[in-house]
């Protein structure tokens, strides 16, 4: 029961986290104009990963997409890549975890397969969360660097002839959404990995029973049959060894005798 709850909660937390990562990636307010001491501005600038926007005091908002790829800063491209990788991994993780949920029965899928899938999705969520946190942190670092650079420029004018208002940018709402969402996805992934341990079937100790046939003394141990069907005591050890390395297809297929060499 606790395992099911942990797995279910991990799934829900990851789902919320990934939704947050998607929202953050799509949001325009990654960086917003620093308003200094003035909360009311006639022209308010803010920027996202995909476009920059200007909101005027008239209420009119104009957004322009970044229609160039090569002209964009490498850091912005890196942040985009990290966020997209995070979303893709998270989406695949969600898909895998749906089938891995203990409360959902799909055909005659065994607990070992579900445990494998739970671990896979858990690792995917962890990596997804880390990608989002890394992406947001890289962008935040870029903002801090640019903020202090533009602050320095504000006080070193062009000979003092003409004052130029330097637009400084600070953290936008998307950064906080991204950090929280990445954290949630990470926590959800950890919960899935914890649930995986509980899902893996416990080793069953069978006592060897001796049957005395006339003229022969043969001992039959049930382990032999189990090894070929994947339910034997070896399964647990196998899980720890290569569970995380399996592909989605391998996890969903039934183990054959070739799986256990």
């Amino acid at each position: 029961m606790a395992v099911t709850a942990c797995q279910g909660l991990g799934f829900v937390v990851s789902l919320i986290g990934i939704a947050g990562i998607i929202a953050a990636t799509c949001m325009d307010q990654w960086s917003t104009q620093d308003l200094y001491n003035n909360p009311v501005t006639a022209v308010f600038n803010y920027q996202g990963l995909w476009r920059s926007c200007v909101r005027e005091s008239s209420g009119f908002t104009e957004c322009r997409g970044y229609f160039t790829l090569l002209g964009l800063p490498a850091m912005l491209q890196a942040v985009r890549a990290l966020m997209i990788v995070g979303i893709v991994l998270g989406a695949i993780g969600l898909l895998v975890s749906i089938f891995a949920l203990k409360c959902i029965r799909i055909g005659s899928m065994e607990d070992s397969a579900k445990a494998n899938m739970t671990l896979t999705s858990g690792i995917m969520f962890i990596v997804s969360g880390l990608c989002a946190i890394a992406g947001v942190s890289v962008f935040a670092n870029m903002l801090v660097t640019n903020f202090w650079m533009s602050t320095a420029n504000m006080y070193t004018g062009m000979g003092g002839m003409v004052q130029t208002v330097q637009t400084r940018y600070t953290f936008g709402a998307a950064l906080f959404v991204g950090w929280v969402a990445g954290g949630l996805t990470l926590i959800g992934g950890v919960m899935m990995c914890i649930a995986c341990r509980g899902l893996a079937p416990e080793e069953t100790n069978y006592k060897a029973v001796s049957y005395h046939a006339s003229g022969h003394s043969v001992a039959y141990k049930p382990g032999g049959f189990k090894a070929s069907t994947g339910f034997g005591s070896n399964t647990k050890n196998k899980k720890i060894y290569d569970g995380g390395a399996r592909t989605e297809d391998e996890v969903q297929s039934y183990p054959s005798k070739h799986d256990y060499v």
Epitope: V40, A42, V43, V54, E56, S57, E62, R64
Partner: antibody, heavy 115, light 113 residues
Framework: EVQLVESGGGLVQPGGSLRLSCAVS?????MNWVRQAPGKGLEWVAW????????TYADDFKGRFTISRDDSKNTLYLQMNSLRAEDTAVYYC???????????WGQGTLVTVSS | DIQMTQSPSSLSASVGDRVTITCKSS????????????LTWYQQKPGKAPKLLIY???TLESGVPSRFSGSGSGTDYTLTISSLQPEDFATYYC?????????FGQGTKVEIK
């Protein structure tokens, strides 16, 4: 079509108060008060976000003038206190439009501060 | 606050003349976010409310004749009337629309020669 009609102007003694009104019909996100002293140029007084009520003022009017709006009546106000002779002017309400220009203006209301 | 300086303060011209009014701001009105200059031009006739002519330094307000044009960037701006018409004799104002407080130039009065 946006229509702006000012009212409330008149003669007031120095140190006195007056409240100007601007009846607004049509869509307005934000509004301004602009004044023009006789024979002089235009002077911006204040701005307000008609949705949030967030105001901002020119330095000369901070503390003396208050811009506000009444959602239910769709009316813009300018409360003027501690009036001085130099506040004598025609007061216009104007809608902020694209590029922060002011595209619709009222007919103006004359405020005369004199003893 | 941004100061706006218009020149000339008045000018005399004839119908059909090309008229140029300049406006200088103490700070750049160019917004880096959209690369637009937040300068506005108005026309005012005696006893009337001002009329918006141009916003974003060069964008003509709907209904304004095409003989009016605006140009400039940063701190220097120009309003040009390509062929002056009788109804164009009025006072013209430039306005900083980039930052609060909004400020107006002192005005340029265009009179009949």
């Amino acid at each position: 079509e946006v229509q702006l009609v000012e009212s409330g102007g008149g003669l007031v003694q120095p140190g006195g108060s007056l409240r100007l009104s601007c009846a607004v019909s049509g869509y307005t996100f934000s509004m301004n008060w602009v004044r023009q002293a006789p024979g002089k140029g235009l002077e911006w007084v204040a701005w307000i976000n008609m949705y949030t009520g967030e105001p901002t003022y020119a330095d000369d009017f901070k503390g003396r003038f208050t811009i506000s709006r009444d959602d239910s009546k769709n009316t813009l106000y300018l409360q003027m206190n501690s009036l001085r002779a130099e506040d004598t002017a025609v007061y216009y309400c104007a809608r902020t439009s694209r590029g922060n220009g002011m595209d619709y203006w009222g007919q103006g209301t004359l405020v005369t501060v004199s003893s | 606050d941004i100061q706006m300086t218009q020149s000339p303060s008045s000018l005399s011209a004839s119908v059909g003349d090309r008229v140029t009014i300049t406006c200088k701001s103490s700070q750049s009105l160019l917004n880096s976010g959209n690369q637009k200059s937040y300068l506005t031009w108005y026309q005012q006739k005696p006893g009337k409310a001002p009329k918006l002519l141009i916003y974003w330094a060069s964008t003509l307000e709907s209904g304004v004749p095409s003989r009016f044009s605006g140009s400039g960037s940063g701190t220097d701006y120009t309003l040009t009337i390509s062929s002056l018409q009788p109804e164009d004799f009025a006072t013209y104002y430039c306005q900083n629309a980039y930052s609060f407080p909004f400020t107006f130039g002192q005005g340029t009065k265009v009179e009949i020669k």
